[in-house]
């Protein structure tokens, strides 16, 4: 039994880091493998993660590490029984993938303006809370070419757009994702999408 692709991990910089790797053949990850993880600190414990399958030879482990700070560094040991298959380390602050925003809502009752709001996925005491920027994706269910991205570079989790920038009388969907420049993070996953019917009063044409 050998590791084909070494574990790579990303942290949500809150409480969970996710590690994925591939073995050299079909593997029952939960019965054959264990990933030990330990904060490099004098009196920290070595926790054990039981991996789950992620495709035939792929394994995934969720490491629980509440109260992450930028200096944290973890040692990782991948075991098959008593055999050490791989040894490495992981610094959560250097591999951050933010949590996805939630509660995306489209408010359509604001005089020909669409107001999209969503929730910051972090509590106020988390460092990322005040450092997230967002991308909002809006697309038409009827027209695959009608697909647009709005970058929200301010901190407020909301976006206002004129309803007239979208076609009237058809259904649209929106979703939002986040990233943080301070830690050079990857983008989060997209939030669940929300749907609305876009309608607005056409401006009265004067001749």
């Amino acid at each position: 039994m050998k590791v084909l692709q070494e574990p790579t991990c990303v942290s949500d910089y809150m409480s969970i880091s996710t590690c994925e790797w591939k073995m050299n053949g079909p593997t029952n990850c939960s019965t054959e493998l264990r990933l030990l993880y330990q904060l490099v600190f004098l009196l920290s414990e070595a926790h054990t993660c039981i991996p789950e399958n992620n495709g035939g030879a792929g394994c995934v482990c969720h490491l629980l590490m509440d109260d992450v700070v930028s200096a944290d560094n973890y040692t990782l040991d991948l075991w098959a029984g008593q055999q050490l298959l791989w040894k490495g380390s992981f610094k959560p602050s250097e591999h951050v993938k933010p949590r996805a925003p939630g509660n995306l809502t489209v408010h359509t009752n604001v005089s020909d303006t669409l107001l999209l709001t969503w929730s910051n996925p972090y509590p106020p005491d988390n460092y990322l809370y005040n450092h997230l920027t967002y991308a909002v994706n809006i697309w038409s269910e009827n027209d695959p070419a009608d697909f647009r991205i709005y970058n929200v570079t301010y901190l407020e989790p909301s976006l206002r757009i004129a309803a007239s920038t979208l076609k009237s009388g058809i259904s649209y969907r929106a979703r939002v994702r986040a990233w943080a420049q301070c830690y050079n993070t990857t983008w989060s996953e997209w939030s669940p999408s929300t749907k609305w019917h876009n309608s607005y009063r056409e401006p009265f044409e004067q001749h």
Epitope: S15, E45, H47, I50, E52, H62, L64, D66
Partner: antibody
Framework: EVQLVESGGGLVQPGGSLRLSCAAS?????????MCWVRQAPGKGLEWIGC?????????YYASWAKGRFTISRDNSKNTVYLQMNSLRAEDTAVYYC????????????????????WGQGTLVTVSS | DIQMTQSPSSLSASVGDRVTITCQAS??????LAWYQQKPGKAPKLLIY???TLAYGVPSRFSGSGSGTDFTLTISSLQPEDFATYYC???????????FGQGTKVEIK
């Protein structure tokens, strides 16, 4: 300094109740580990009572013999874990230790306490009339 | 619940001796076994976890081995400060129990 300090022990009558406290210092009691209680009757061996997960999930596990009479809780704002003991009997006389534990996890919701790494000095509970 | 059978319950040895203590689990507990040392009036001290990993600050004369149901603690050359009681701790998440062995008291011969 990283340490655990138990308090609340003493003499209690059979059938009575007692609440023990374990104050953590030098680390956050809300970080990813379990806080557990272990006891040792005079001249006897060690006996696991139960554990509470100190992170956001707060799950608890108990030894089968402790379910019902013993309850573990926590107050993260005070960095303190508690052991509530009810319907005490003479055989509950012991030194009660608080300990921090590692865990085994599968996914993010299944977390089981494993070995006890950091121990307090213990507090003596005597159940006698 | 699992049962942990530790043997011997006591032994007499001299400084410099090699000492072996065994612990047997009533079911397969993989490598979820730890060893503790306890001196009178003191809290237990972690020696070894995951059956064979030495805890921080523990001298290398202590070693652990085994997996599944049979485990061993070895002190390669007994020192005066090693006279104490030793406990194994087995953890079984399948039955939901953390069980200590009965203890082994290591006394001066």
């Amino acid at each position: 300094e990283v340490q655990l300090v138990e308090s609340g022990g003493g003499l209690v009558q059979p059938g009575g109740s007692l609440r023990l406290s374990c104050a953590a210092s030098g680390f956050s009691s809300s970080s990813a580990h379990y806080m557990c209680w272990v006891r040792q009757a005079p001249g006897k061996g060690l006996e696991w009572i139960g554990c509470i997960y100190a992170g956001s999930r707060g799950s608890t596990y108990y030894a089968s013999w402790a379910k019902g009479r013993f309850t573990i809780s926590r107050d993260n704002s005070k960095n303190t874990v508690y052991l509530q003991m009810n319907s005490l009997r003479a055989e509950d006389t012991a030194v009660y230790y608080c300990a921090r534990a590692a865990f085994v996890n599968r996914g993010v919701s299944w977390i089981w306490p494993y070995y006890f790494s950091l121990w307090g000095q213990g507090t003596l509970v005597t159940v006698s009339s | 619940d699992i049962q942990m059978t530790q043997s011997p319950s006591s032994l007499s040895a001299s400084v410099g001796d090699r000492v072996t203590i065994t612990c047997q689990a009533s079911e397969d507990i993989e490598s979820y076994l730890a060893w503790y040392q306890q001196k009178p009036g003191k809290a237990p001290k972690l020696l070894i976890y995951r059956a064979s990993t030495l805890a921080y600050g523990v001298p290398s004369r202590f070693s652990g081995s085994g997996s599944g149901t049979d485990f061993t603690l070895t002190i390669s050359s007994l020192q005066p400060e090693d006279f104490a009681t030793y406990y194994c701790l087995g953890s079984s998440y399948s039955t939901g129990s953390n069980i200590f062995g009965q203890g082994t008291k290591v006394e001066i011969k």
